[in-house]
C-alpha cells in the first residue's frame, strides 16, 4: 500500500509518464542544507552527492557523544522524502547535500548564508539545469538571511523552506518570512494542521501552502535499509521540493513565479480546519495542501493568480500597509481589510517602476491589511486609471477607456473617516459593466490591462440585508483577478480573494445589532486569456 | 510574505555617523542599522554579519574588513574576519566585541549589521 503522504500529493488523473525530463540535458538538481546524511542508504544511494561544504557550530554540552546515526538522522530522512527510490516524492531526483546543521540539528544564520553563497558560486562555475534549494530549518527573523534568499531566487533558483514548528506566525522566522521563498506548513493524514507536542506547524500570511508533514515514512540513518517515521514542517517542505523537482524536470523553463502559481493552483483547497489557527491568523493562512499537477500539458494555457497579504499596518491614524507581487507577476487588483472596519480603503500605486497595493488605516482603527491579486500575464501592459471623488450624488465611477484595455480590478480610497454610514450605496447603471463604481466621497482606481486575448467580465452577488460574509465565484475556465465590495459602506470590513472566490466581510450583525444598513454586494472580476484557451483546445 | 525591510520586531539601532579617526563618513543622510534576533536564547553575540551596499566589489569588502580590524586594534580589541561574502551579498563575517558595533556601523559602504543567531532543524 502506498504511504498516505504520497497518496495525498498524487491527483486522481495523474500521468506519471509526463514527469520524465524531455531529454537528459535538463537534469534538476536539489540542494539540501541540513545535517550530514548517510549517503549509502538504499533509498538515496547514487542519488545524493555529498558536497565538501560544512559550516556548523559546536554541539552544546560537554558530555555530547557524536553518534553517526543521530548526526545523519534529519538530513537522511529528508533526502529520502525528496528522492528516495521507494518512499520518495521525486524518485529520480539528483541531490547535493551541504552540512549546515550539527548533530543536535542546530546551525547558524552565518553558516546558512555561506552555504547559500556556495550554491550560487557552484551555479556560476558549472551552470546546469534548474536548481531547487531545500532549507528545512528556521531561526528568528533575519534580514540578512532573507536578503540572501532573495538574491538567490532572483538568480533563478527555487528555494523551498519549512514554515517552522513553533505554532506561531511564520513571518517571525527566517527563511520562512522571505517573500521569494516557497514556505511550507505541515498537515496530517486528516488534512489538518500538525500538532508537535505542545507546539505545531507555523501559519499565517508568510506560508504559501501546506503539505504532508506528520508520520512521514522515510530513510532512517540507523541502517542502510532502515525506515523511520518523522514529523515536522521540514518533511512538508521536502514534499514540495520533490513536487517542484518533478514539475521542473517536465518543464525546465518554468520561472519561480510560474512554479509557485502552479503549486497553489493544483493544491487541494479548503480542506484544512482553520479553527486550529488563532482567529486573527485564519484569514491570512492559505487553506491549501500541495499536490502534483495531474498533467503538465495545458497548464501553461491558464491565467494563474494568487492572493498576497501585506503585513499588518499597525493602529496609528496614518498607518498604511503595502502588498507586493513578485517581479514576474502583474498586480491586477488591490483590496483592503480591517477587523475593526475602520479603514480608508486602498489604492494601486507605482513604486520602483512596479505597481503595489497600499491600504490605509482610519482614525480609531486597529490597523489594515492590503491584499494584492498577483497574476501571471505575459506581455501585459497594465495601468491604473483614477477618478477623484465625485461632486454629484450618483457616486464616483471610472472605466478603461484605452482601446483593447480591459478592467481587471477596482479599488477605492477615501479621506473621510466614516464613509457611507448614512448614505445609500450607489448601484451600477445597467449595461455598463466595464467600470468601477464607488462612493461619491471616494476616489476610484481601475486597473486596466492590455494583454493578447485577455477578456474579463464582472460578476456580482448582492444580499439585501447585511451578512457576515458575501461571496461570488468565477466559473470554471475563468480566473478571479479582482474582488471588491460595491460600494464600501461603514459595516464592510473589506474584501479579499480566496482561490477563485471573492469574499466580502461585514461586521457581525448579531453583535452590532444593526440591520438598517443597506445591501452588501461582492463584485468579482473574472478573466481568461482567449488565445491561451484556444491554444489549450488545440492541444487536446 | 515578509517585506524585505522587515517590519518585524528585530532590534534596530540607528547610530548616526560621528567623527572617528580613519572612518570615512557614510554617504550623506544614510544610516547603517544594527539588527539582532528577537528571540534572546537564539542570539549569538560576538559574531556579526556586516552587510555592505549592493554594488560593493569584493576588493572594497576586503578593504572595509581590514579597516575595521585596524580601527579595532587601535582601541585594543582583537577581531577575526571569518569569511568575506561575495556572489550573493557583499559583506563579511566578523568575530568581535559588541563594543565595536558603533565603530563598524560608521564604516564606508556599510548597509546594516546583523548579529549572528541560531537556526534549527524543523
Amino acid at each position: 500500500s502506498i504511504p498516505w503522504n504520497l497518496e495525498r500529493i498524487t491527483p486522481p488523473r495523474y500521468r506519471a509518464d509526463e514527469y520524465q525530463p524531455p531529454d537528459g540535458s535538463s537534469q534538476v538538481e536539489v540542494y539540501l542544507l541540513d545535517t550530514s546524511i548517510q549517503s549509502d542508504h538504499r533509498e538515496i544511494e547514487g542519488r545524493v552527492m555529498v558536497t565538501d561544504f560544512e559550516n556548523v557550530p559546536e554541539e552544546d554540552g560537554t558530555r555530547f557523544h557524536r553518534q553517526a546515526s543521530k548526526c545523519d538522522s534529519h538530513g537522511t530522512h529528508l533526502a529520502g522524502v525528496v528522492s528516495g527510490r521507494d518512499a520518495g516524492v521525486a524518485k529520480g531526483a539528483s541531490m547535493r547535500s551541504l552540512r549546515v546543521l550539527n548533530c543536535q540539528g542546530k546551525g547558524t544564520v552565518s553558516g546558512t548564508l555561506i552555504g547559500l553563497e556556495f550554491i550560487r558560486k557552484s551555479q556560476l562555475i558549472q551552470p546546469s539545469g534548474p536548481l531547487v534549494v531545500l532549507l528545512p530549518l528556521a531561526g528568528g527573523y533575519s534580514r540578512v538571511l532573507n536578503a540572501a534568499c532573495q538574491r538567490l531566487a532572483r538568480a533563478g533558483v527555487v528555494l523551498v523552506t519549512a514554515a517552522g514548528n513553533f505554532r506561531d506566525d511564520a513571518c517571525l522566522y527566517s527563511p520562512a518570512s522571505a517573500p521569494e521563498v516557497i514556505t511550507v506548513g505541515a498537515t496530517n493524514a486528516q488534512d489538518q494542521p500538525v500538532t508537535l507536542g505542545t507546539l505545531g506547524t507555523n501559519f499565517g500570511r508568510c506560508v504559501d501552502l501546506f503539505a504532508p508533514g506528520e508520520d512521514i515514512i522515510g530513510a532512517s540513518s540507523d541502517c542502510s535499509t532502515c525506515f523511520v517515521s518523522q514529523s515536522g514542517t521540514s518533511q512538508a517542505a521536502a514534499h514540495v521540493a520533490g513536487i517542484a523537482a518533478m514539475m521542473l524536470s517536465a518543464e525546465p523553463e518554468l520561472t519561480l513565479a510560474e512554479l509557485r502559481q502552479r503549486l497553489i493552483h493544483f493544491s487541494a483547497k479548503d480542506v484544512i480546519n482553520e479553527a486550529w489557527f488563532p482567529e486573527d491568523q485564519r484569514v491570512l493562512t492559505p487553506n491549501l495542501v500541495a499536490a502534483l499537477p495531474p498533467s503538465t500539458h495545458g497548464a501553461g494555457w491558464q491565467l494563474f493568480c494568487r492572493t498576497v497579504w501585506s503585513a499588518h499596518s499597525g493602529p496609528t491614524r496614518m498607518a498604511t500597509a503595502v502588498a507586493r507581487c513578485a517581479p514576474d507577476e502583474e498586480l491586477l487588483s488591490c483590496s483592503s481589510f480591517s477587523r475593526s472596519g475602520k479603514r480608508r480603503g486602498e489604492r494601486m500605486e507605482a513604486q520602483g517602476g512596479k505597481l503595489v497595493c497600499r491600504a490605509h488605516n482610519a482614525f480609531g482603527g486597529e490597523g489594515v491589511y492590503a491584499i494584492a491579486r498577483c497574476c501571471l500575464l505575459p506581455q501585459a501592459n497594465c495601468s491604473v486609471h483614477t477618478a477623484p471623488p465625485a461632486e454629484a450624488s450618483m457616486g464616483t465611477r471610472v472605466h478603461c477607456h484605452q482601446q483593447g484595455h480591459v478592467l481587471t480590478g477596482c479599488s477605492s480610497h477615501w479621506e473621510v473617516e466614516d464613509l457611507g454610514t448614512h448614505k445609500p450605496p450607489v448601484l451600477r447603471p445597467r449595461g455598463q459593466p466595464n467600470q468601477c463604481v464607488g462612493h461619491r466621497e471616494a476616489s476610484i482606481h481601475a486597473s486596466c490591462c492590455h494583454a493578447p486575448g485577455l477578456e474579463c467580465k464582472v460578476k456580482e452577488h448582492g444580499i439585501p440585508a447585511p451578512q457576515e460574509q458575501v461571496t461570488v465565484a468565477c466559473e470554471e475556465g475563468w480566473t478571479l483577478t479582482g474582488c471588491s465590495a460595491l460600494p464600501g459602506t461603514s459595516h464592510v470590513l473589506g474584501a479579499y480573494a480566496v482561490d477563485n472566490t471573492c469574499v466580502v466581510r461585514s461586521r457581525d450583525v448579531s453583535t452590532t445589532g444593526s440591520t438598517s444598513e443597506g445591501a452588501v454586494t461582492a463584485v468579482a472580476i473574472c478573466c481568461r486569456s482567449r488565445h491561451l484557451a484556444q491554444a489549450s483546445q488545440e492541444l487536446q | 510574505q515578509e517585506d524585505e525591510d522587515g517590519d518585524y520586531e528585530e532590534l534596530v539601532l540607528a547610530l548616526r555617523s560621528e567623527e572617528d579617526g580613519l572612518a570615512e563618513a557614510p554617504e550623506h543622510g544614510t544610516t547603517a542599522t544594527f539588527h539582532r534576533c528577537a528571540k534572546d536564547p537564539w542570539r549569538l553575540p560576538g559574531t556579526y554579519v556586516v552587510v555592505l551596499k549592493e554594488e560593493t566589489h569584493l576588493s572594497q569588502s576586503e578593504r572595509t574588513a581590514r579597516r575595521l580590524q585596524a580601527q579595532a586594534a587601535r582601541r585594543g580589541y582583537l577581531t577575526k574576519i571569518l569569511h568575506v561574502f561575495h556572489g550573493l551579498l557583499p559583506g563579511f563575517l566578523v568575530k568581535m566585541s559588541g563594543d565595536l558595533l558603533e565603530l563598524a556601523l560608521k564604516l564606508p559602504h556599510v548597509d546594516y549589521i546583523e548579529e549572528d543567531s541560531s537556526v534549527f532543524a524543523q
Epitope: 500500500s1 502506498i2 504511504p3 498516505w4 497518496e7 495525498r8 486522481p12 496530517n188 493524514a189 486528516q190 488534512d191 489538518q192 500538525v194 500538532t195 505545531g200 506528520e214 508520520d215 487541494a268 479548503d270 480542506v271 480546519n273 482553520e274 479553527a275 486550529w276 485564519r282 487553506n287 460574509q469 461571496t471 | -
Partner: antibody, heavy 121, light 109 residues
Framework: EVQLLESGGGLVQPGGSLRLSCKAS????????MHWVRQAPGKGLEWIGR????????KYNEKFKGKATISRDNSKNTLYLQMNSLRAEDTAVYYC??????????????WGQGTLVTVSS | DIQMTQSPSSLSASVGDRVTITCRAS??????LTWYQQKPGKAPKLLIY???SLQSGVPSRFSGSGSGTDFTLTISSLQPEDFATYYC???????????FGGGTKVEIK
C-alpha cells in the same frame, strides 16, 4: 455541557424537500466543523457532508452533491440540512455531529439524538 | 476512494469474553481511524480516536491499535452494557470526506 438538538424530521412525500435543524449549545459554535450523517433503518452510518461555521465552507459526499445543502446561522448557533427531491431510499435517521480536536486528531465527539425522516406517499 | 471493511459483521459473545473487531482500509490512513459505539435507538458515541487514544469517560477495557490499513478494536472483558454495534471511520482525502465501515454487531451468546 455540549448539546446538539435536531429537529425538522417527519413524513415527507416522494419528490418533496425538507430542512432539518441542529441547535448547538455549551461551546463556541463557530470554532468546530459540523457534520451531517444519516442511517437508514437497519443499515450503517453514511456521511452526508460538513460545514465550517467560521467561514461557511462546505464539503459533500459525492452522492449528495446537488441533493443536500448544508448551511448555518452563527447568531443562532444552528446548523441546517436542506434535502431536495426526496425518495423512499432517503428514509433514515439524520444526525448532526460536532468535529472535535484531540491532540493532533479530529473525531465526531458529540452527536445529536437524531431525527427520523420518512419518505412515503 | 477509500473503502472500510469491518469484520466480522456480527459476533456472539458472553460477558467476560475478550472480543476483537478488525477494520481494514483500502488505502493508508496513517493513524487516523476512529471507533464509535451505537446502541439501538441511540446516537453513535465516540470510543477511540487516532487509532488508539481512548475518549475520556470510556472504560479502559476498550483499546484500539493499528496504523496504515489494518486496525483493531479490542474489548478485554465484555460487559453487559457493551452489547452494541461498533463502527470504524476514516477520512477519505480524495473526497475530502468521511467513510464508515459497515459495522460489527456484538450480540449476547
Amino acid at each position: 455541557e455540549v448539546q446538539l438538538l435536531e429537529s425538522g424530521g417527519g413524513l415527507v412525500q416522494p419528490g418533496g424537500s425538507l430542512r432539518l435543524s441542529c441547535k448547538a449549545s455549551g461551546y463556541t459554535f463557530s470554532s468546530y466543523w459540523m457534520h451531517w450523517v444519516r442511517q437508514a433503518p437497519g443499515k450503517g452510518l453514511e456521511w452526508i457532508g460538513r460545514i465550517d461555521p467560521y467561514n461557511g465552507g462546505t464539503k459533500y459526499n459525492e452522492k449528495f452533491k446537488g441533493k443536500a445543502t448544508i448551511s448555518r446561522d452563527n447568531s443562532k448557533n444552528t446548523l441546517y440540512l436542506q434535502m431536495n427531491s426526496l425518495r423512499a431510499e432517503d428514509t433514515a435517521v439524520y444526525y448532526c455531529a460536532r468535529y472535535g480536536y484531540y491532540l493532533g486528531s479530529y473525531a465526531m465527539d458529540y452527536w445529536g439524538q437524531g431525527t427520523l425522516v420518512t419518505v412515503s406517499s | 476512494d477509500i473503502q472500510m471493511t469491518q469484520s466480522p459483521s456480527s459476533l456472539s459473545a458472553s460477558v467476560g469474553d475478550r472480543v476483537t473487531i478488525t477494520c481494514r482500509a483500502s488505502q493508508d490512513v496513517s493513524r487516523y481511524l476512529t471507533w464509535y459505539q451505537q446502541k439501538p435507538g441511540k446516537a453513535p458515541k465516540l470510543l477511540i480516536y487516532a487509532a488508539s487514544s481512548l475518549q475520556s469517560g470510556v472504560p479502559s477495557r476498550f483499546s484500539g491499535s493499528g496504523s496504515g490499513t489494518d486496525f483493531t478494536l479490542t474489548i478485554s472483558s465484555l460487559q453487559p452494557e457493551d452489547f452494541a454495534t461498533y463502527y470504524c471511520q476514516a477520512y477519505d482525502y480524495s473526497l475530502s470526506g468521511y467513510v464508515f465501515g459497515g459495522g460489527t454487531k456484538v450480540e449476547i451468546k
